[in-house]
């Protein structure tokens, strides 16, 4: 015959432990039921009656099976520099994370204690390491042949455009400026002629710049077949 299933409360066998979702009550010296997440122990068990559980009140919670007399208080409302990524329910605490453009400068066990704005990289410097939820941006000087002309927490150093003839050489904070060439000149086979060398720009999505009023004369290195850019004059 199968062993008889003991119903709580029951006295455990000497040397044995209580089962899953049960706890040993020292006063009653019995194995008693734990309360489920979202509840707490309203009345502790005795030798003859099991634990009486009750639901957590508003703004309180229990996340685990428990026998606590009171539910835990949910954390305070998220501050203005934070967003609530997990609401306070009877079974889980509120979790606040930093809003976009901010990072967690001082963390706590769950969520964030203090958010701070991500630093931005000034012109002449690009993002070496992007900010994350818990770390700030790291900037680096733009290497020769690259530039950044923005103050941004996302823009990397971008290559200077490659000119047929350079009017103004680029530097760390400015792109190269190309001279105008006669429109009769044909494009080298396989070369792509763009008003802006978009393919070498920042990897981050940005508004498309307005086309320049002056005819563009920049030439990119051959990159294989590609349709001419919109607004291309086909010189």
């Amino acid at each position: 015959l199968p062993a008889q299933v003991a119903f709580t409360p029951y006295a455990p066998e000497p040397g044995s432990t209580c089962r899953l979702r049960e706890y040993y009550d020292q006063t009653a010296q019995m194995c008693c039921s734990k309360c489920s997440p979202g509840q707490h122990a309203k009345v502790f068990c005795t030798k003859t009656s099991d634990t009486v559980c009750d639901s957590c009140e508003d703004s309180t919670y229990t996340q685990l099976w428990n026998w606590v007399p009171e539910c835990l208080s949910c954390g305070s409302r998220c501050s203005s520099d934070q967003v609530e990524t997990q609401a306070c329910t009877r079974e889980q605490n509120r979790i606040c994370t930093c809003r976009p453009g901010w990072y967690c400068a001082l963390s706590k066990q769950e969520g964030c204690r203090l958010c701070a704005p991500l630093r931005k990289c000034r012109p002449g410097f690009g993002v070496a390491r992007p900010g994350t939820e818990t770390s700030d941006v790291v900037c680096k000087p733009c290497a020769p042949g690259t530039f950044s002309n923005t103050t941004s927490s996302t823009d990397i150093c971008r290559p200077h455009q490659i000119c047929n003839v350079v009017a103004i050489p680029g530097n760390a904070s400015m792109d190269a400026v190309c001279t105008s060439t006669s429109p009769t000149r044909s494009m080298a086979p396989g070369a792509v002629h763009l008003p802006q060398p978009v393919s070498t720009r920042s990897q981050h999505t940005q508004p498309t710049p307005e086309p320049s009023t002056a005819p563009s004369t920049s030439f990119l290195l051959p990159m294989g077949p590609s349709p001419p850019a919109e607004g291309s004059t086909g010189d």
Epitope: A116, P117, K120, R122, F125, P141
Partner: antibody
Framework: QSVEESGGRLVTPGTPLTLTCKAS????????MTWVRQAPGKGLEWIGI?????DSYYATWAKGRFTISKTSTTVDLKISSPTTEDTATYFC?????????????????WGPGTLVTVSS | AIKMTQTPASVSEPVGGTVTIKCQAS??????LAWYQQKPGQPPKLLIY???KLASGVPSRFKGSGSGTQFTLTISDLECADAATYYC????????????FGGGTEVVVK
């Protein structure tokens, strides 16, 4: 590149006062600017900072008592209702921008300071 | 909130000696720490930024070190002109802060 404060004077308690910091040789739209004060014989006490976009952040003790704002050429510090404890030399300083950061967290240049005396 | 604690409050050393000033942050501030020198009647002067980098025109006798929460300013080969008050300043964060500066250390050169 330099900054200079002005507007410090003797005021009676409760009389609002605005100090001005004028920038020379650089654009205020490119740098964070900060205000710091120093009571006679005491240490440096940070008041607050204004970023390139014009957002201001204050020391916990200074919130509601001070307002930092800027125009294209000046950064202003308004003391809403001065008390005798606000007697100090007030300094304006520019973030260095070192390391290529918009907020490098170090300050240079500093102005010579302007003295505010609050007394009845 | 991050609090900066500077020690000692005052130190006296002879010309040619070495002074060590310590600064402790209550939280990790990585390397976002600056040191300033201030003489009576003058504004503070930036000496060190990012914990160990020497500001322009500052003699190499001034050395900054440390990261995280513990930082040190060492002044070697002391000169009479080094007599001043020195302040550390955290540049990590400006949100929810009481004071970004330490309390200051007065250096007396004998």
């Amino acid at each position: 590149q330099s900054v200079e404060e002005s507007g410090g004077r003797l005021v009676t308690p409760g009389t609002p006062l605005t100090l001005t910091c004028k920038a020379s040789g650089f654009s205020l739209s490119d740098y964070f600017m900060t205000w710091v004060r120093q009571a006679p014989g005491k240490g440096l006490e940070w008041i607050g900072i204004i970023n390139t976009g014009g957002d201001s952040y204050y020391a916990t003790w200074a919130k509601g008592r001070f307002t930092i704002s800027k125009t294209s050429t000046t950064v202003d510090l308004k003391i809403s209702s001065p008390t005798t404890e606000d007697t100090a030399t007030y300094f304006c300083a520019r973030d260095t921008g070192y390391g290529g950061y918009d907020y490098a967290g170090s300050f240079d240049p500093w102005g010579p300071g302007t003295l505010v005396t609050v007394s009845s | 909130a991050i609090k900066m604690t500077q020690t000692p409050a005052s130190v006296s050393e002879p010309v040619g000696g070495t002074v060590t000033i310590k600064c402790q942050a209550s939280e990790n501030i990585n390397s976002w720490l600056a040191w300033y020198q201030q003489k009576p009647g003058q504004p503070p002067k930036l000496l060190i930024y990012e914990a160990s980098k020497l500001a322009s025109g500052v003699p190499s006798r001034f050395k900054g070190s440390g990261s995280g929460t513990q930082f040190t300013l060492t002044i070697s080969d002391l000169e009479c002109a080094d007599a001043a008050t020195y302040y550390c300043q955290q540049g990590y964060i400006y949100i929810d802060v009481g004071n970004i500066f330490g309390g200051g250390t007065e250096v007396v050169v004998k």
